[in-house]
Interface confidence: medium
Amino acid sequence: TLNSVLINSNAIKNLPPPLGGAGGQPGSAVSVAPGVLYEGGNKYQTLDNYQPYPCAEDEECGSDEYCSSPSRGAAGVGGVQICLACRKRRKRCMRHAMCCPGNYCKNGICMPSDHSHFPRGEIEESIIENLGNDHNAAAGDGYPRRTTLTSKIYHTKGQEGSVCLRSSDCAAGLCCARHFWSKICKPVLKEGQVCTKHKRKGSHGLEIFQRCYCGEGLACRIQKDHHQASNSSRLHTCQRH
């Protein structure tokens, strides 16, 4: 259901401003208040983990997903959108959120990013192309889209803890991740830090305390020496490819 909540999805694309999430130091085992599991009897535990997750905005999806109409050519019939798998390098795109972490949308194609492809003070602005099948870039659905943002911001990039709407609002080495009240700039995860991996596509609700994604050259994988009774609760950490 739209109200199901999973505490620990890694959905960090385009988070809103942090109302105040805190976090660990870049070298600590758990990064700054990223993806913290809820205590207190699973206060916000999700009920229906394995439903395709309905969404209205990319922010509600995982870092390896974007929000779009599920059926090709359906033109968003009934306005139903779900979280879909991100597009890999060289795949077609309409906006940055469609591309997998480490990539951005340039001239309608997902390209590798090196965190320096946007001049300081500019927000990424993708070129809208008619891909024919992805309809959630339409501006008429009542939800703001990254593609309709103004191209310039006139403030300096946000430091850790600054409220943000998207990762381009944050300084290098930080991503924009939800910290409940808002989205804030949090450190991109380093090797060995705990990360969050969705068990299955669309298996999450709106994450409240999000972790950033793993940094360049790292992937979120099960920690080899981590043995727990439940497969579903295995610890994932950022590891070298």
């Epitope: 401003p17 999430g21 700054v32 913290v36 803890g161 009240w181």
Partner: antibody
Framework: EVQLVQSGAEVKKPGASVKVSCKAS????????IHWVRQAPGQGLEWMGW????????TYAQKFQARVTMSRDTSSSTAYMELSRLESDDTAMYFC?????WGQGTLVTV | QSVLTQPPSVSGAPGQRVTISCTGS?????????VHWYQQLPGTAPKLLIY???NRPSGVPDRFSGSKSGASASLAITGLRPDDEADYYC???????????FGGGTQLTVLS
């Protein structure tokens, strides 16, 4: 169980300072920000600022910038909010919040 | 004067549906910042009802729902009950103030 327990009610004279504490338990203190929100009698909620429990970095609402100091003691998992140069309209209930959990409130009467 | 505008009061009979609006601007709700809703009973701390526009924490009945349109958000309560009588606040972030902001609050009265 996550809990935020605040210090007891305070009565202060105008011009004085007050320091309210907020002791956290049931979670990793340094993984969260602590916000302070106040509510004058019969009035709405007003955000005062937050402190990053790990680094101690703070952000204050402009209105309180010159008078408020937020601090924390990681060894005791306690956050503090000190408000100086008190005036009668600072009479309010002061809440600390981890965003999803709130303290019970501390009544400060000036 | 609050940055987020709520009606001072609303009322309804038991079983009825009421909505509480929260009107912001392009620097808060309209900019895409989340809206959260709190219920506050007299003498208690605010309790989270809705977060991220429309998400309910567990334990909050599905009679409570939230939505957003443009620079406004609203809270709907169906099947009104006497114990719903409380103050309700919306909350967001305002980038022109660099501050978290609350609505002025709405007092809900359940008519007997």
């Amino acid at each position: 169980e996550v809990q935020l327990v605040q210090s007891g009610a305070e009565v202060k004279k105008p011009g004085a300072s007050v320091k309210v504490s907020c002791k956290a338990s049931g979670y990793t203190f340094t993984d969260y920000y602590i916000h302070w929100v106040r509510q004058a009698p019969g009035q709405g909620l007003e955000w005062m600022g937050w402190i990053h429990s790990n680094s101690g970095a703070t952000t204050y609402a402009q209105k309180f910038q010159a008078r408020v100091t937020m601090s924390r003691d990681t060894s005791s998992s306690t956050a503090y909010m000190e408000l100086s140069r008190l005036e009668s309209d600072d009479t309010a209930m002061y809440f600390c919040s981890r965003e999803d959990y709130w303290g019970q409130g501390t009544l400060v009467t000036v | 004067q609050s940055v987020l505008t709520q009606p001072p009061s609303v009322s309804g009979a038991p079983g009825q549906r009421v909505t509480i609006s929260c009107t912001g601007s392009s620097s808060n709700i309209g900019a895409g910042y989340d809206v959260h809703w709190y219920q506050q009973l007299p003498g208690t701390a605010p309790k989270l009802l809705i977060y991220g526009y429309s998400n309910r924490p567990s334990g909050v009945p599905d009679r409570f729902s939230g939505s957003k349109s443009g620079a406004s958000a609203s809270l709907a309560i169906t099947g009104l009950r006497p114990d719903d009588e409380a103050d309700y606040y919306c909350q967001s972030y305002d980038n022109s103030l660099s501050s978290y902001v609350f609505g002025g609050g709405t007092q809900l009265t359940v008519l007997s």
